[in-house]
C-alpha cells in the first residue's frame, strides 16, 4: 500500500502531559508509516 504521509521529516516525540508538541510527530506515528516500517501484518503463505 502506498504511503500517504511522507517520511522525510522526522519530528521529535512529544512530551506526555504538555499542552503542545515541539514538533508534529503524527506522521512518524501514522498508519502509513507503520506499513512502511513495521512488521508485515499478514505474512505471505508459502
Amino acid at each position: 500500500l502506498a504511503d500517504p504521509l511522507d517520511h522525510r521529516d522526522a519530528g521529535d516525540l512529544w512530551f506526555p502531559g504538555e499542552s503542545e508538541s515541539f514538533e508534529d510527530a503524527h506522521v512518524e506515528h501514522s498508519i502509513s508509516r507503520s506499513l512502511l516500517e513495521g512488521e508485515i501484518p499478514f505474512p505471505p503463505t508459502s
Epitope: D6, S21, E23, H29, F42
Partner: antibody, heavy 114, light 112 residues
C-alpha cells in the same frame, strides 16, 4: 488492506453510558497514535480524544468538552481502540470516527435523547 | 485554543476552472524544524473525511496532483488547478500541533 471499523453506537438516554470500539486490521498497530473525532449532523469535525503508543506510556489527551466523561483506551493485542462515554449529554449526539489522521473509519452514530 | 478559520464557506465552481480555499490559524503552526502542522481533508457527501495534504504542502498518496497546498505559519491555501465533478464536498483544514486539535469550519465546494 487497512481497515478501521467502529461499532457500539446507538440510542442512549441523557446521563447514560456507551462504549465505542474501533477494530483495526491491515497494518502494524502498536506504534500508531489513534484518535476519535466526532461530527454532529450537518456540522463540522471535532477532535475529542487521542491516545499514543506504549512507548509513550499510552498518553491520552482530551477535548475540554469531553474531559472527565470520556476515556480513550487501546488493546494492542486486539488492535482495537475504545471510547468509554459516561454522563452522556444531548450535545454528544454525533457520528464518531476513529482515525490515525491518515486513514479514517466509516463512523458509528451515537444518539443521546430521552 | 488555536482557532482555524476558512474562506469562503461556500464555493461554486465551474468544472475545469481553478478553485482556491483559504485557511488561517490564530497562532503559528510552524515548528522549530521547519514543519508546518497544517492538514487538509475532503469529506465527500455521505463519506468519511479523506486526507488530501499533510504538513501544509505534501500531497497524500492517491490524491491527484490537481491539488496543492501552500502557505506560511498562519495563512494557508488549498488550490485545485482544474475542478472536476468528483471534487464536490466539504474541505477542512486542521492543526495537529497544539491541544486541543482543531478543524476549520469547512468550505463546501459545489459544481455550478
Amino acid at each position: 488492506e487497512v481497515q478501521l471499523v467502529e461499532s457500539g453506537g446507538g440510542l442512549v438516554q441523557p446521563g447514560g453510558s456507551l462504549k465505542l470500539s474501533c477494530a483495526t486490521s491491515g497494518f502494524p498497530f502498536s506504534n500508531v497514535w489513534m484518535h476519535w473525532v466526532r461530527q454532529a449532523s450537518g456540522k463540522g469535525l471535532e477532535w475529542i480524544a487521542h491516545i499514543k503508543a506504549k512507548s509513550d506510556n499510552y498518553a491520552t489527551y482530551y477535548a475540554e468538552s469531553v474531559k472527565g466523561r470520556f476515556t480513550i483506551s487501546r488493546d494492542d493485542s486486539k488492535t482495537t481502540i475504545y471510547l468509554q462515554m459516561n454522563s452522556l449529554k444531548t450535545e454528544d449526539t454525533a457520528v464518531y470516527y476513529c482515525t490515525g489522521l491518515d486513514y479514517w473509519g466509516q463512523g458509528t452514530t451515537v444518539t443521546v435523547s430521552s | 485554543d488555536v482557532v482555524m478559520t476558512q474562506s469562503p464557506l461556500s464555493l461554486p465552481v465551474t468544472p475545469g476552472e481553478p478553485a482556491s480555499i483559504s485557511c488561517r490559524s490564530s497562532r503559528s503552526l510552524l515548528t522549530s524544524k521547519g514543519i508546518t502542522s497544517l492538514y487538509w481533508y475532503l469529506q465527500k457527501p455521505g463519506q468519511s473525511p479523506q486526507l488530501l495534504i499533510y504538513r501544509m504542502s505534501n500531497l497524500a498518496s492517491g490524491i491527484p496532483d490537481r491539488f496543492s497546498g501552500s502557505g506560511s505559519g498562519t495563512d494557508f491555501t488549498l488550490k485545485i488547478s482544474r475542478v472536476e465533478a468528483e471534487d464536490v464536498g466539504v474541505y477542512y483544514c486542521a492543526q495537529f500541533l497544539v491541544y486541543p486539535y482543531t478543524f476549520g469550519p469547512g468550505t463546501k465546494l459545489e459544481i455550478k
